[in-house]
C-alpha cells in the first residue's frame, strides 16, 4: 500500500498502532452471524433511521447525540469498546478510513463466501454511524484493490 505523503502520516500510524480494533472485529462478526441466524435482516430497514426529523431536518448532525448510547444496557461490550477506540480517529477522517480498512483486512480471511464478505462491508460502513461519529468518504474497503489509499 502506498504511504501517504502528507504531514500527519506518522501521527496516524502511531494512532493505528496504539488502537485496539479487535473489539470492532468481534462486534461486526457477531452482528453478521446474528443476522444470518435471523434469516437475513433487510439492510434497507435498519432499526435506527439516520434520517429521522427529530435528529436533523435533512440528516443527523454528526455531533448531535449518538444513536448509539454508550451507557445503554443493550449495547454489547464489544461495540462500546469499539466505539471508544474509533472515537480517537474522529478528527482525522483519513486515519478513520485506515482504521476501517485495517478491520476489513484483518477479517477478510475469516469471511466465508462473497455474501458474508458483502454483509461485513455493509456493517463496517455503518460502524461510524453506530458510534455517533462522522464517516470518512472516498474510503475504499476492497481488500483486493491495489490503489487503495485514494482517500
Amino acid at each position: 500500500r502506498q504511504q501517504w505523503e502528507l504531514q500527519g502520516d506518522r501521527r496516524c500510524q502511531s494512532q493505528l498502532e496504539r488502537a485496539n480494533l479487535r473489539p470492532c472485529e468481534q462486534h461486526l462478526m457477531q452482528k453478521i452471524q446474528r443476522d444470518e441466524d435471523s434469516y437475513g435482516r433487510d439492510p434497507y430497514s435498519p432499526s435506527q433511521d439516520p434520517y429521522s426529523p427529530s435528529q436533523d431536518p435533512d440528516r443527523r448532525d454528526p455531533y448531535s447525540p449518538s444513536p448509539y448510547d454508550r451507557r445503554g444496557a443493550g449495547s454489547s461490550q464489544h461495540q462500546e469498546r469499539c466505539c471508544n477506540e474509533l472515537n480517537e480517529f474522529e478528527n482525522n477522517q483519513r486515519c478513520m478510513c485506515e482504521a476501517l480498512q485495517q478491520i476489513m483486512e484483518n477479517q477478510s480471511d475469516r469471511l466465508q463466501g462473497r455474501q458474508q464478505e458483502q454483509q461485513f462491508k455493509r456493517e463496517l460502513r455503518n460502524l461510524p454511524q453506530q458510534c455517533g461519529l462522522r464517516a470518512p468518504q472516498r474510503c475504499d474497503l476492497e481488500v483486493e484493490s491495489g490503489g487503495r489509499d485514494r482517500y
Partner: antibody, heavy 121, light 107 residues
C-alpha cells in the same frame, strides 16, 4: 431551511469561461464534502467534481480535468466551480450536492435546483 | 472503470409492484444510493442500501443489494411515483458513478 442554491449559469461560447456558485444554509458546512453533478438535456446524471470540508482534497471526472476547478469559501458557506475552455458537450444543468456524513461512502443527501449552462456559438 | 447497468424503462399498473435493478460487479459489497427525479426537478435521495429509507420516503419504497445486483422495490405503486430512478455508488477507480437511469411509467 437546510438547502443549497446554485447560480452563475448562462450562455457562453465554446472556449469561454463561467463560474458557478453554490450557497449553503442551515447546516454545518465544514463537516461536508460538496460536489457538482451535471445532467445534459435528456440525459442521465454525471458527477463532475468534489471537495472536502477544508478544501485540501479535490477530485474531478476525467473529461473536465485541467479545465474545471472546484473551490470553497467556508466563511461564506459557498462552493464554486470555475469552468474554463468550455465545450459544447459541457452543456447541462449543473447541480450542487452535499455528500452525507453518517455512513462510509454516503450518498448525495441534499441537492440544489440546478443552474443551466449552455455552450453554443 | 466501474459501470452500473439499469434497464431503460419499467411500466407498472397502479397498486402493483415495480422492481428497478442496478447491475454492477460485486455491487453487494458497495453502498448503493437510489435517487428519484421527476420532470423539471432536481434528484432526490430516496433510499440507501446501508441506511434504508429517508424519513421523507414512503415506506412503500424498499430494496435489496446482494451479489451483482441491487434492486429498488416500489410496492403499491401510485401515479406520483412516475419518475426517473438512478442508482449510484462510489468506486475507487471511477469515483461517483451513476446508472443510466430507469424511467418508471404508471399505466
Amino acid at each position: 431551511e437546510v438547502k443549497v442554491v446554485e447560480s452563475g449559469g448562462g450562455l457562453v461560447q465554446p472556449g469561454g469561461s463561467l463560474r458557478l456558485s453554490c450557497a449553503a444554509s442551515e447546516f454545518t458546512f465544514t463537516y461536508y464534502w460538496m460536489s457538482w453533478i451535471r445532467q445534459a438535456p435528456g440525459k442521465g446524471l454525471e458527477w463532475v467534481a468534489n471537495v472536502n470540508g477544508d478544501a485540501t482534497e479535490k477530485y474531478y471526472v476525467d473529461s473536465v480535468k485541467g479545465r474545471f476547478t472546484i473551490s470553497r469559501d467556508n466563511p461564506k458557506k459557498t462552493v464554486y466551480l470555475q469552468m474554463n475552455s468550455l465545450r459544447v458537450e459541457d452543456t447541462a444543468v449543473y447541480y450542487c450536492a452535499r455528500v452525507g456524513t453518517t455512513v462510509v461512502n454516503d450518498g448525495f443527501d441534499l441537492w440544489g435546483l440546478g443552474t443551466m449552462v449552455t455552450v453554443s456559438s | 472503470s466501474y459501470v452500473l447497468t439499469q434497464s431503460h424503462s419499467v411500466s407498472v399498473a397502479p397498486g402493483q409492484t415495480a422492481r428497478i435493478t442496478c447491475g454492477g460487479e460485486n455491487i453487494g459489497g458497495k453502498g448503493v444510493h437510489w435517487y428519484q427525479q421527476k420532470p423539471g426537478q432536481a434528484p432526490l435521495l430516496v433510499v440507501s442500501s446501508d441506511t434504508g429509507r429517508r424519513s421523507v420516503t414512503p415506506d412503500r419504497f424498499s430494496g435489496s443489494n446482494s451479489g451483482d445486483t441491487a434492486t429498488l422495490i416500489i410496492s403499491r405503486v401510485e401515479a406520483g411515483d412516475e419518475a426517473d430512478y438512478y442508482c449510484q455508488v462510489w468506486d475507487p477507480t471511477s469515483e461517483y458513478v451513476f446508472g443510466s437511469g430507469t424511467k418508471v411509467t404508471v399505466l
